[in-house]
Amino acid sequence: APTSSSTKKTQLQLEHLLLDLQMILNGINNYKNPKLTRMLTFKFYMPKKATELRHLQCLEEELKPLEEVLNLAQSKSFHLRDTKDLISNINVIVLELKGSETTLMCEYADETATIVEFLNRWITFCQSIISTLT
């Protein structure tokens, strides 16, 4: 059974992940972002089901494409810290949260998503899991 300290650690990691994803989304949605139209042409893939921490495997598998699209707007459009570092940090958190005991084959939904829909989906996921922990 999870201890209160492990629950607290999980909650803090989810909050960190949530803040990183929200920061990216805020940067993209910034009204000054001239890259939004271009960024929206890139397709992202969503999980059929995302209700447990192990489903973060689906986020992990889309982090490289996410980094590529963020690189399109790194310097001028929104002020993220180095994209590579940001994605790397997210990756570390995701790996810790999902655990390595069970290797899940992610099941993806048939329909694709824009970067905005993709980020919103994972923000909602984080918020949902955090609410069950508190």
Epitope: K35, T41, F44, E61, P65, E67, E68, L72
Partner: antibody, heavy 121, light 113 residues
């Protein structure tokens, strides 16, 4: 149809700079990124970087960072690649290229004819 | 950076025979979301720019003869010319088209035996 037409061959002295142009036609230059790839004589292909002509955003390969400058002039549908502090190893054919479609950044489907840059004292 | 290792360096094949070129990447090029492998194959003839033959590991570019086919997944890929023609003499390159910087294999020179 999509066409990329590059400027002519150049002979340059070591330490100088070269500026190669790439004129796009058959599509709006702001629709997609323009990439630059080089090929030394008898060697393989090496990606140098891309520019987004819409806003001048660039992404350079680490190897060329600080020596290459990519620019674009949307009024003439032309992209430029300037390489400074030339050395003999920069002798190569320089290509501009465009991706297959605008739904991913690569691969390159449309290529300029290439510009030979010779660096010699 | 992803390293692309191509083999063999050169290949001599009789006209009408099959030519096979291999490419190995140092990281998986499979994007599981769409089950696409971000690998492309190019043909380059002397004095010409590269020509895209195959993308997504196995999709033929428009106008490319169907004797050219691509296969493989993850880290191991193959370009096959089912029946070599005289006009196929060229250097062939693989390209990982997944992550910046995009990286090419060193090339395979195909000649007629």
């Amino acid at each position: 149809q999509v066409q990329l037409v590059q400027s002519g061959a150049e002979v340059k002295k070591p330490g100088s700079s070269v500026k190669v142009s790439c004129k796009a036609s058959g599509y709006s230059i702001t629709d997609d990124l323009i990439h630059w790839v080089r090929q030394a004589p008898g060697q393989g292909l090496e990606w140098m970087g891309w520019i987004d002509p819409e806003d001048g955003e660039t992404n350079y390969a680490q190897k060329f960072q600080g020596r290459v400058t990519l620019t674009a002039d949307t009024s003439t549908s032309t992209a430029y690649m300037e390489l400074s502090s030339l050395r003999s190893e920069d002798t190569a054919v320089y290509y501009c290229a465009r991706s297959l479609d605008s739904t991913w950044i690569y691969p390159f489907a449309y290529w300029g004819q290439g510009t030979l840059v010779t660096v010699s004292s | 950076d992803i390293v692309m290792t191509q083999s063999p360096d050169s290949l001599a094949v009789s006209l009408g025979e099959r030519a096979t070129i291999n490419c190995k990447s140092s990281q998986s090029l499979l994007r599981r979301g769409n089950q696409k492998n971000h690998l492309a194959w190019y043909q380059q003839k002397p004095g010409q720019p590269p020509k895209l033959l195959i993308y997504d590991a196995s999709t033929g570019q428009s106008g490319v003869p169907d004797r050219f086919s691509g296969s493989g997944s993850g880290t191991d890929f193959t370009l096959t010319i089912s029946s070599l023609q005289a006009e196929d003499v060229a250097v062939y390159y693989c390209l990982q088209s997944y992550i910046t910087p995009p990286t090419f294999g060193a090339g395979t020179k195909v000649e007629i035996k």
